[in-house]
Interface confidence: low
Amino acid sequence: FKVATPYSLYVCPEGQNVTLTCRLLGPVDKGHDVTFYKTWYRSSRGEVQTCSERRPIRNLTFQDLHLHHGGHQAANTSHDLAQRHGLESASDHHGNFSITMRNLTLLDSGLYCCLVVEIRHHHSEHRVHGAMELQVQTGKDAPSNCVVYPSSSQDSENITAA
């Protein structure tokens, strides 16, 4: 399977909400022994390998934001910790999973990574990630709503397996 990032760049005004999205592509094993660990974290643009560093999003680490479920099941984080920080991650039946960030500030600007780990018999079998940039703007040049820029087809299905 692969992870696609429909949009590589999100440009949003301060105070707006944004939903960053990734999509699981390709055949997904629905066996009872297979689950998917999906999560989000921040990383650094200047890395040798994009998304290799896992930094918190608003002080929430990737395990705080993770979803753990089978195949294309739906799930979402509803715990108070994420909601207190204006965050919610979610996954639907179609392989889409997302993180919603509320009341954006300039500090939210940066590189965001989605991570999917396929777990078989409790062992990590396969891991892929996607990356996208969030730019939060303020002042007269800021857009009135979030503007999204589609990934090129090459980028949107970029897969990095460790």
Epitope: E47, S52, E53, T61, Q63, D64, L81, V117, S124
Partner: antibody, heavy 123, light 106 residues
């Protein structure tokens, strides 16, 4: 409480393979967010990060040494291993393992270190 | 590689004196981490995410900085602060340490 203990051969000859073991207690490397690194320090000098292994078996290596390094783990026996092939006198150092917990309260630093083991490479 | 340069390499301070040591990164990093090491001991975590004190670190210590320039400050030097301090970045592989600043008590 969390403890880490490093064991190794003490002395090796050039071109031999170094095998180090980090035995730990007080935490599980199967726990989401857990990781262990290897760091070394030549006598009287600074620290050099070598490799890191995450709970999900994801691995990171120092690129300058990557061809000689292999990090692995046995979560069930609470051990992390490091192999360095073709050692030379430049590999003479104290080797440490350290835990890195990507947790909410104490994110992203080595919070517990092993006591270190000294390796001397000499012919 | 991100090269971490610590200055000064060696410094001494009298009890009660304010101490500042710096760590300069060859390219911008998001956060800085500091460790304290005393002779014949393993390093101890001291400051993480640039300005947060690790457990048990006295409040006279502080950390600050951004981009390529970071610093560790002791507001009032005490004898137990004599040690070598290392900075480290987790921004890009290899996750490099600085060469250390050795702080002595006068």
């Amino acid at each position: 409480q969390v403890t880490l203990k490093v064991s190794g051969p003490g002395i090796l000859q050039p071109s031999q393979t170094l095998s180090l073991t980090c035995s730990f207690s007080g935490f599980s490397l199967s726990t989401s967010g857990m990781g262990v690194s290897w760091i070394r320090q030549p006598s009287g000098k600074g620290l050099e990060w070598l490799a890191h292994i995450y709970w999900d078996d994801d691995k990171r290596y120092n690129p300058s040494l990557k061809s000689r390094l292999t990090i692995s783990k046995d979560s069930s026996s609470n051990q992390v291993f490091l192999k360095i092939t073709s050692v030379d006198t430049a590999d003479t150092a104290t080797y440490y393992c350290a835990r890195r917990l990507d947790g909410y309260n104490d994110p992203y630093y080595f919070d517990y270190w092993g006591q270190g083991t000294t390796l001397t490479v000499s012919s | 590689d991100v090269v971490m340069t610590q200055t000064p390499a060696l410094m001494s301070a009298s009890p009660g004196e304010k101490v500042t040591m710096t760590c300069s990164a060859s390219s911008s990093v998001s956060y800085m981490y500091w460790y304290q090491q005393k002779p014949r001991s393993s390093p101890k975590p001291w400051i993480y995410l640039t300005s947060n004190l690790a457990s048990g670190v006295p409040a006279r210590f502080s950390g600050s900085g951004s981009g390529t320039s970071y610093s560790l400050t002791i507001s009032s030097m005490e004898a137990e602060d004599a040690a070598t301090y290392y900075c480290q970045q987790w921004n890009s592989n290899p996750y490099t340490f600085g060469g250390g600043t050795k702080l002595e008590i006068k």
